[in-house]
C-alpha cells in the first residue's frame, strides 16, 4: 500500500503537472495572434481512457507534437519556453507513471485541438488530485 509520504509526493507532482498545463492553456487563451488560428489546426490524439497514472503514457506520447505547436507561438507576449516546459512536464510524467511501464496507450478515434487536449489532461489531473486530497 502507498505510504502517506508517497501519496503526498504523487499529489505534489500532479499539482505541478496541473499547473504547467494550466499555464499553457492560459498562455494560449491570452494569445492574440494570427498564429493561434494555425495552432488550432494541429490535431492531438486523445486517450480512449484516462483514469489512472499509467494512462499518462498517452500524454507522454503527445509531448513532442505539443512542443512543436508551442514553438509556433513564440513571441514577446508568450512567456512559456517550450523546450523547458515540455522537459519539465516529461520529467513529472515519467515519475508519475513510472519509467518501467509497459502500458500501451489506446487512443480515441476522434482527434482534438490543443485546447481540447489540454482541457482533457487538466481534468485528468484534477480528478486524481481530488481522490488523493
Amino acid at each position: 500500500a502507498p505510504t502517506s509520504s508517497s501519496t503526498k509526493k504523487t499529489q505534489l507532482q500532479l499539482e505541478h503537472l496541473l499547473l504547467d498545463l494550466q499555464m499553457i492553456l492560459n498562455g494560449i487563451n491570452n494569445y492574440k495572434n494570427p498564429k493561434l488560428t494555425r495552432m488550432l489546426t494541429f490535431k492531438f490524439y486523445m486517450p480512449k481512457k484516462a483514469t489512472e497514472l499509467k494512462h499518462l503514457q498517452c500524454l507522454e506520447e503527445e509531448l513532442k507534437p505539443l512542443e512543436e505547436v508551442l514553438n509556433l507561438a513564440q513571441s514577446k507576449n508568450f512567456h512559456l519556453r517550450p523546450r523547458d516546459l515540455i522537459s519539465n512536464i516529461n520529467v513529472i510524467v515519467l515519475e508519475l507513471k513510472g519509467s518501467e511501464t509497459t502500458f500501451m496507450c489506446e487512443y480515441a478515434d476522434e482527434t482534438a485541438t490543443i485546447v481540447e487536449f489540454l482541457n482533457r489532461w487538466i481534468t485528468f489531473c484534477q480528478s486524481i488530485i481530488s481522490t488523493l486530497t
Partner: antibody, heavy 113, light 107 residues
Framework: QVQLVQSGAEVKKPGASVKVSCKAS????????MHWVRQAPGQGLEWMGI????????SYALKFQGRVTMTRDTSTSTVYMELSSLRSEDTAVYYC??????WGQGTLVTVSS | DIQMTQSPSSLSASVGDRVTITCRAS??????LAWYQQKPGKAPKLLIY???SLDEGVPSRFSGSGSGTDFTLTISSLQPEDFATYYC?????????FGQGTKVEIK
C-alpha cells in the same frame, strides 16, 4: 520556519517601473510554484500570474500581459515581480504566495506624481 | 474567466453567533475552491482548501462545504478574533479569481 519575505514599500512616478522581491526560506524553493496577487486600497484580491521557480517560465493574467515580468534567482531562493508603465491604479499592496498557504507580508507600491 | 460572487458583502454578528457566507462560481469548479481570512494590514490566511478541507492550525469552528458552483463557509460560533474579511477563490482554471469579499463586523 517556512516564510516569504518581501522587499520594502516603494513610491514611483507614473510611467516608471517597480521591481518587488520575495525571498523564500524554510523549504525547498523549487518545490512550490509562486503566485503574485495584488490588492488596491480597500479593494479585493487580484491574481497577477505565476512562475515555475525551477524552470523559470511564467504565465500572466491577461490584464497585466505586456507590463509584468516575473523572474527568479534559484541561488538566492528569490522571485521578482516587475511591473512597468505604472499608473495611479497600480497603487496597491503586492503579495507573493507559495502554494497559497504561505504568503509574503506584502509590499505597498504607491504611484503618484 | 470564472466569476466568483460572494454574499453578503458585509454582515454584523455577535460573539457566539453562527455565521454563513456563500460563494457562487459562474461555472462548475468541482471542489477547486479555497477560503481566506484577511485582517487589516495583513496578508490573507488560508482557512479551507478543496472546498471542505481545513488547513493546518485552523480552528474547527470553521467549515466549508459545496461543490460545482455553490459553496459555503460556516463559522459555528463566532469568536472575537474572527472579525475580518473573508474571500473565496477558485483555482480550477487560470486566471485564478477571487470573490469580492465579505466583511464580518461586530454588531
Amino acid at each position: 520556519q517556512v516564510q516569504l519575505v518581501q522587499s520594502g514599500a516603494e513610491v514611483k512616478k507614473p510611467g516608471a517601473s517597480v521591481k518587488v522581491s520575495c525571498k523564500a526560506s524554510g523549504y525547498t524553493f523549487t518545490r512550490y510554484y509562486m503566485h503574485w496577487v495584488r490588492q488596491a486600497p480597500g479593494q479585493g484580491l487580484e491574481w497577477m500570474g505565476i512562475i515555475n521557480p525551477r524552470a523559470g517560465y511564467t504565465s500572466y493574467a491577461l490584464k497585466f500581459q505586456g507590463r509584468v515580468t516575473m523572474t527568479r534567482d534559484t541561488s538566492t531562493s528569490t522571485v521578482y515581480m516587475e511591473l512597468s508603465s505604472l499608473r495611479s491604479e497600480d497603487t496597491a499592496v503586492y503579495y507573493c504566495t507559495s502554494g497559497w498557504d504561505v504568503w509574503g507580508q506584502g509590499t505597498l507600491v504607491t504611484v503618484s506624481s | 474567466d470564472i466569476q466568483m460572487t460572494q454574499s453578503p458583502s458585509s454582515l454584523s454578528a455577535s460573539v457566539g453567533d453562527r455565521v454563513t457566507i456563500t460563494c457562487r462560481a459562474s461555472q462548475s469548479i468541482s471542489t477547486w475552491l479555497a477560503w481566506y481570512q484577511q485582517k487589516p494590514g495583513k496578508a490573507p490566511k488560508l482557512l479551507i482548501y478543496a472546498a471542505s478541507s481545513l488547513d493546518e492550525g485552523v480552528p474547527s469552528r470553521f467549515s466549508g462545504s459545496g461543490s460545482g458552483t455553490d459553496f459555503t463557509l460556516t463559522i459555528s460560533s463566532l469568536q472575537p478574533e474572527d472579525f475580518a474579511t473573508y474571500y473565496c477563490q477558485q483555482s480550477y482554471s487560470f486566471p485564478v479569481t477571487f470573490g469580492q469579499g465579505t466583511k464580518v463586523e461586530i454588531k
